[in-house]
C-alpha cells in the first residue's frame, strides 16, 4: 500500500480552488480522468470527468467544477469556482483504467471553506469566474461509477491514509449521466 497524503486548502466562500494533478503522460494522456469527493465510509463519488478519450486542453464544466486535461504536460487542472461552505471535504483526482480500478493521483485535497470574504483592496476575487459567463455548449457524457465492493473508502482520521490500487475487475454497468459544459477561455 502507498501512503497517500492530504494537502489542505483553506478558502472563503466565493473563492476558487485551483489544483493540478500530475500523471504519467505516456500511460494516461488520453485516459478519462475524474474529480471525486470522498465521504466517511462511502465510496468515492465522481463529481466531474473528462471526455472519453480525454481531449487535450479542452475545458469541461460540470456545475461549478472545471476540468482541463493538458496531455502534453501530463497535467489535469481542476477548478471549483464560487466555493460554498458545504463544498468542504476530501477530494481526489483519479484516472479511469478499466477493467482495473481507478488510479488515484497524489495528493488528496482537504478543502476547508469558511464563511466571509478575505479579498484585499485591489484584488480581483471574481476574475476567474467571469470567463464562465459565455453561453455554453452542452454535451452529454458518461462518468463510470466506482462500484467495486473493495473500494469503500474510509476518510483517513489523520493526515495520511493507506490506499492500495489492486488490479481487481470492476463493474461498469452503473453509470451516471453528467452534463459537461465545454468552457472557452
Amino acid at each position: 500500500a502507498t501512503k497517500l497524503t492530504e494537502e489542505k486548502y483553506e478558502l472563503k466562500e466565493g473563492q476558487t480552488l485551483d489544483v493540478k494533478c500530475d500523471y504519467t503522460l505516456e500511460k494516461f494522456a488520453s485516459s478519462q480522468k475524474a474529480w471525486q469527493i470522498i465521504r466517511d465510509g462511502e465510496m468515492p463519488k465522481t463529481l466531474a470527468c473528462t471526455e472519453r478519450p480525454s481531449k487535450n486542453s479542452h475545458p469541461v464544466q460540470v456545475g461549478r467544477i472545471i476540468l482541463e486535461d493538458y496531455h502534453d504536460h501530463g497535467l489535469l487542472r481542476v477548478r471549483m469556482v464560487n466555493l460554498q461552505v458545504e463544498d468542504s471535504g476530501l477530494y481526489q483526482c483519479v484516472i479511469y483504467q478499466p477493467p482495473k480500478e481507478p488510479h488515484m493521483l497524489f495528493d488528496r485535497i482537504r478543502l476547508v471553506v469558511t464563511k466571509g470574504f478575505s479579498g484585499t483592496p485591489g484584488s480581483n476575487e471574481n476574475s476567474t469566474q467571469n470567463v464562465y459567463k459565455i453561453p455554453p455548449t452542452t454535451t452529454k457524457a458518461l462518468c463510470p461509477l466506482y462500484t467495486s465492493p473493495r473500494t469503500v473508502t474510509q476518510a483517513p482520521p489523520k493526515s495520511t491514509a493507506d490506499v492500495s490500487t489492486p488490479d481487481s475487475e470492476i463493474n461498469l454497468t452503473n453509470v451516471t449521466d453528467i452534463i459537461r459544459v465545454p468552457v472557452f477561455n
Epitope: 502507498t2 501512503k3 497524503t5 494537502e7 486548502y9 483553506e10 478558502l11 472563503k12 473563492q15 476558487t16 485551483d18 489544483v19 493540478k20 494533478c21 500530475d22 500523471y23 504519467t24 503522460l25 505516456e26 500511460k27 493538458y70 504536460h73 501530463g74 497535467l75 487542472r77 497524489f106 495528493d107 485535497i109 478575505s118 480581483n124 476574475s127 476567474t128
Partner: antibody
C-alpha cells in the same frame, strides 16, 4: 520526515560541466514532481527546472534551456541536474525541492550545494 | 512570464510589532501564490500556499491574504526568529514559475 540532500557542487571553469544529485527520502518519491531552484550570491530565488513524478515531463527556465538536463531515478530515489556549457552567471547555490502534490510550489527543500563558475 | 514584485525591499520592525509584506503579480493568478521564509545560510521554508493556507508547523501569527494580483503576508507579532527574507512565488499553471525579489524583515 522528508529529507533532501544535494551533492556535486564545486568550482568549474566557464564552458565546463557539472552534475548535481539529490538523494530523497521520507516520502513516495515517484509520486511527486521535483525541481531545482537556484540562488546567486546575495540574490533572490530563481526556478531552474522541474521533472514530473514519472519523469515523463520536464520543464526548464529559458536561461538554462539546452544546457541543463534534469532527470530522476525512481528506483534509487535520486534527482539529477546535468549542467553543461556553464557560465559565470550560473554561479549559485542550487537547491533540490519537492513539488507539492497539488500545485507547483515547493513544500520541502534541501540545504543546497554551491556551484561556482570561474576561471 | 509573470513578474512578481515585492514591497518594501526592506522592512524594519521591532519585536512584538506587526509586519505587513506585499506581493504583486503582473497578471491575475487567482490564489496560486506561495510565501517562503529564508534565514541567512539556510534553505527557504514554505510558510503559506494557495495564498491563505499555512503549511504544516507554521505558527498562526503568519497569515496570508489577497487574490488576483495583490497579496499580503502578515506577521501579527514579530518574534526574534521571524527576522529573515520572505519571498512570494506564483504557480498559476505552466512555467516559468517566478519568485518575487524578496523582502528583508530586519530588527528596528
Amino acid at each position: 520526515e522528508v529529507q533532501l540532500l544535494e551533492s556535486g557542487g564545486g568550482l568549474v571553469q566557464p564552458g565546463g560541466s557539472l552534475r548535481l544529485s539529490c538523494a530523497a527520502s521520507g516520502f513516495t518519491f515517484n509520486a511527486y514532481a521535483m525541481s531545482w531552484v537556484r540562488q546567486a550570491p546575495g540574490k533572490g530565488l530563481e526556478w531552474v527546472s522541474t521533472i514530473s513524478g514519472s519523469g515523463s515531463t520536464t520543464y526548464y527556465a529559458d536561461s538554462v534551456k539546452g544546457r541543463f538536463t534534469i532527470s530522476r531515478d525512481n528506483s534509487k530515489n535520486t534527482l539529477d541536474l546535468q549542467m553543461n556549457s556553464l557560465r559565470a552567471e550560473d554561479t549559485a547555490v542550487y537547491y533540490c525541492a519537492k513539488v507539492a502534490g497539488s500545485n507547483f510550489f515547493f513544500d520541502h527543500w534541501g540545504q543546497g550545494t554551491l556551484v561556482t563558475v570561474s576561471s | 512570464e509573470i513578474v512578481m514584485t515585492q514591497s518594501p525591499a526592506t522592512l524594519s520592525v521591532s519585536p512584538g510589532e506587526r509586519a505587513t509584506l506585499s506581493c504583486r503579480a503582473s497578471q491575475s493568478i487567482n490564489h496560486n501564490l506561495a510565501w517562503y521564509q529564508q534565514k541567512p545560510g539556510q534553505a527557504p521554508r514554505l510558510l503559506i500556499y494557495g495564498a491563505y493556507t499555512r503549511a504544516t508547523g507554521i505558527p498562526d501569527r503568519f497569515s496570508g491574504s489577497g487574490s488576483g494580483t495583490e497579496f499580503t503576508l502578515t506577521i501579527s507579532s514579530l518574534q526574534s526568529e521571524d527576522f529573515a527574507v520572505y519571498y512570494c512565488q506564483e504557480f498559476i499553471l505552466f512555467p516559468p514559475w517566478t519568485f518575487g525579489q524578496g523582502t528583508k524583515v530586519e530588527i528596528k
